[in-house]
């Protein structure tokens, strides 16, 4: 709150703007007839220093010259960059009660001279854009600094524009509002930037450029694609461009891809034929432009055109598998399964599948279309049957895939040997085997088939399978493999007209079961006890159960229990034991064992055999 200097004046030497590290002398003078009322010698002039409106110092001790009661000069040093406010006040020393009265004030700015502007870069966006230049101003000056951008060119013309930097705004870019047109393509322009403030001035080095150096074409617009005869692989990409463009870069990719296909097109005039597109695929297309074959800059990429290529008829063959179940003495149920074509083979939306079952000798043919990936029919058990399936989209159908229907596990000599299943990690199982020992006919291929061992899995869930060439003896199965679930795995060896199989159970990860089997009944027959149980609920098995254990001991005995270990069979739910004494009460229970360990015990049952036991 400085009054408008009624009492006196404050002056600065050498100037109110000084370079960093310089000292300044501040003189405070009272106007005539101003000051303390009684006598001038009681006038005391003090100088206060403020930074950001905060009093930081009383410069009483920095007085270098004093006309008592009239004026004082103070030397200030070590001023920091930016603005510092100094206020001179009058202190009437005889009156302790009155606060000092403001006389006048001054602001001193400390800064540096501007550095020469560097890295000047000019750009004109599009043929009808305007020239804008930017530069690097160098170190902050802490002072108001004016910049003049000067562009000299043909017709003896110079264009200039100014802006300034201070503590509120930065000036390092100017748009001159002038357009350079293609008729100036051969002309040279010179640009320079001059910076000036109260402490000095500096100029950039001149920077020379041509029209082609600085004009960046606008990105192409109105992009569209026309597919020739509704082809899914050939299309003509069209776009609008600025008139002077001579070179285009096209990039395109399927939407889920991570790498672009790149094409350079010279004198394309807004049109280019693409011949390697994938049918029925979502593509993204972008185009960039350049005004000169060798010099100049590429435009930004255009906005993306996203479109799907048309369908084409499916290619590739379906992977077919089947299951055979006898219904009665003269009928069998055939269930055919097949895997969906991958998108590059389907080349469109598969509308349906054409399924054919044919009896080879009698020429009986069953045909149907289905939208599903399985098909079930009841056929006679007699005769040699073959199946074929093809996939159809709006443009046509794939070539049919044929498979001979044979008794998949009918030929023992074709059964693979030494089948094993090892867990590789959480979600796959490595299956290995040895070829059949005495196969009558050559193995054409192996099929590894797997299904979760859970109630109703045969009816509810289709099998999963892998086709393996005849010279491979292993398969890593991962599709639909989950940890802590036991799978039945079959390895089929198929010849032209026969099949043999071997089965094993496997899991990808296992834990000890959550609980033991539940003993439901203990019965005595012919001097033997039969223990019956219900299997552990599927979610509680936590992998493949290797065997069950039946434990027993005399009631109230502290001795270790005896046990009997039974190989796990899914179909078995009772087992005899014959080493119990008659008329002794026993406690019995069961546990289940996986590769990870033994379950807690199941329920306990007491039983006292009556008859004579061995």
């Amino acid at each position: 709150n400085i009054d408008v200097c009624k009492l006196g004046t404050v002056t600065v030497q050498p100037a109110p703007v000084i370079p960093l590290g310089s000292a300044a002398n501040i003189s405070c003078s009272l106007n005539p007839k101003q000051g303390c009322s009684h006598y001038p010698s009681s006038n005391e002039l003090i100088l206060l220093k403020f930074v950001n409106d905060v009093l930081v110092e009383n410069l009483h001790g920095k007085k270098v010259h004093d006309h008592t009661g009239h004026s004082s000069t103070f030397q200030v040093t070590n001023l920091s960059l930016g603005m510092t406010l100094f206020v001179c006040k009058l202190n009437c020393s005889n009156s302790q009660k009155k606060p000092p009265v403001p006389v006048c004030g001054v602001e001193i700015s400390v800064g540096v001279a501007p550095e020469p502007p560097q890295n000047i870069s000019c750009v004109q966006e599009g043929e009808n854009g305007t020239v804008a230049c930017s530069w690097n101003s160098g170190k902050v000056t802490y002072l108001k600094t004016n910049y003049t951008l000067q562009l000299s060119g043909p017709n003896n013309l110079t264009c200039q524009k100014q802006c300034f930097s201070d503590n509120r705004q930065n000036c390092n870019r100017l748009d001159l509002g002038i357009n350079l047109s293609p008729d100036l393509a051969e002309s040279r322009f010179i640009v320079r930037v001059t910076a000036i403030n109260d402490l000095g001035n500096s100029s950039s080095l001149p920077h020379t450029f041509t029209f082609l150096d600085i004009v960046i074409p606008l990105p192409p617009w109105d992009i569209r694609i026309n597919f020739l005869n509704a082809s899914g692989s050939r299309g003509t990409l069209q776009w609008e461009d600025e008139g002077q463009v001579v070179l285009n870069q096209l990039r395109y990719q399927p939407l889920n891809s991570t790498s672009w296909n790149m094409v350079n097109a010279t004198n394309a005039k807004g049109k280019y034929d693409l011949r390697d597109l994938r049918p029925f695929t979502e593509y993204e297309f972008q185009i960039s432009s350049k005004l000169h074959l060798s010099g100049g800059s590429w435009s930004n990429w255009s906005e993306s055109l996203r479109t799907r290529t048309p369908e084409e008829e499916p290619v590739g063959i379906l992977d077919i598998w089947y299951m055979k179940q006898d219904i009665d003495y003269d009928r069998q149920q055939i269930s055919l399964f097949w895997k969906s074509l991958n998108p590059s083979e389907a080349r469109g939306k598969i509308l349906h599948y054409q399924v054919t079952l044919q009896e080879v000798t009698k020429k009986t043919t069953l045909q149907n279309t289905t939208r599903h990936t399985s098909w079930t029919r009841v056929i006679p058990r007699t005769g040699a049957w073959t199946a074929s399936v093809s996939a159809a989209n709006s443009k046509g159908a794939s070539a049919p895939t044929h498979i001979n229907i044979v008794d998949l596990c009918g030929t023992g000599l074709l059964a693979p040997h030494q089948v094993s299943a090892k867990s590789e990690n959480m979600d796959n199982i490595l299956v290995t085997w040895q070829p059949p020992k005495k196969a009558d006919s050559a193995v054409r291929e192996y099929i590894v088939e797997w299904r979760a061992l859970q109630p109703g899995s045969i009816t509810k869930f289709p099998p999963h399978w892998l086709r393996i060439p005849p010279d491979n003896m292993s398969a890593l199965i991962s599709e639909n493999i989950k940890p802590y679930i036991c799978y039945e795995i079959r390895v089929h060896a198929l010849s032209e007209s026969q099949g043999g199989c071997s089965s094993i159970r496997g899991d990808s990860k296992h834990k000890a079961p959550v609980s033991g089997p539940h003993i439901t009944a203990i019965t005595e027959k012919k001097e033997r006890l039969f223990i019956s149980w219900t299997h552990i609920p599927f979610p509680e098995q936590r992998g493949c159960i290797l065997h069950y254990r039946i434990y027993w001991k005399e009631r109230d005995s502290t001795a270790q229990p005896e046990l009997c270990e039974i190989q796990y069979r899914r179909s078995q739910n009772s087992h005899p034991i014959s080493s119990l004494q008659p008329r002794v009460t026993y406690v019995l229970w069961m546990t289940a064992v996986t590769a990870a360990g033994e379950s807690p015990q199941g329920n306990e049952r007491e039983f006292c055999p009556q008859g004579k036991a061995n």
Partner: nanobody
Framework: QVQLQESGGGLVQAGGSLRLSCAAS????????IGWFRQAPGKEREFVAA????????FYVDSFKGRFSISRDNAKNTVYLQMNSLKPEDTAVYYC????????????????????WGQGTQVTVSS
């Protein structure tokens, strides 16, 4: 319709200064370029300086740069030409003119590109 009115011309001694004014009526200069041209007796009209109203850029013929400067007053919708160190060969009728976009480098100094013209003001520099 834009009307342009020059003023500030007159007789001045060599080495002296004059400030010419160009006031627009009818509409603002907004996105125009306002140029100063001059025509000496028996000579072709020649470009002196111009100002892009919206961009704030100034254009000078190299031979006048340093002696002449162009400026504006937004509130008064007026453009000025400050002429210092005048010489007898600066004697001419000085015209102000306005051109519409686009503003191309090639067109700035060409009088046919300017659609609106004032009546001119006489500047005479005596030796």
């Amino acid at each position: 319709q834009v009307q342009l009115q020059e003023s500030g011309g007159g007789l001045v001694q060599a080495g002296g200064s004059l400030r010419l004014s160009c006031a627009a009526s009818g509409r603002t200069f907004s996105n125009s370029v306002i140029g100063w041209f001059r025509q000496a007796p028996g000579k072709e009209r020649e470009f002196v300086a111009a100002l892009s109203w919206s961009a704030g850029s100034e254009f000078y013929v190299d031979s006048f740069k340093g002696r002449f400067s162009i400026s504006r007053d937004n509130a008064k919708n007026t453009v000025y030409l400050q002429m210092n160190s005048l010489k007898p060969e600066d004697t001419a009728v000085y015209y102000c003119a306005a051109k519409n976009p686009p503003h191309r480098w090639s067109d700035i100094g060409k009088s046919p590109q300017y659609a609106y013209w004032g009546q001119g003001t006489q500047v005479t520099v005596s030796s």
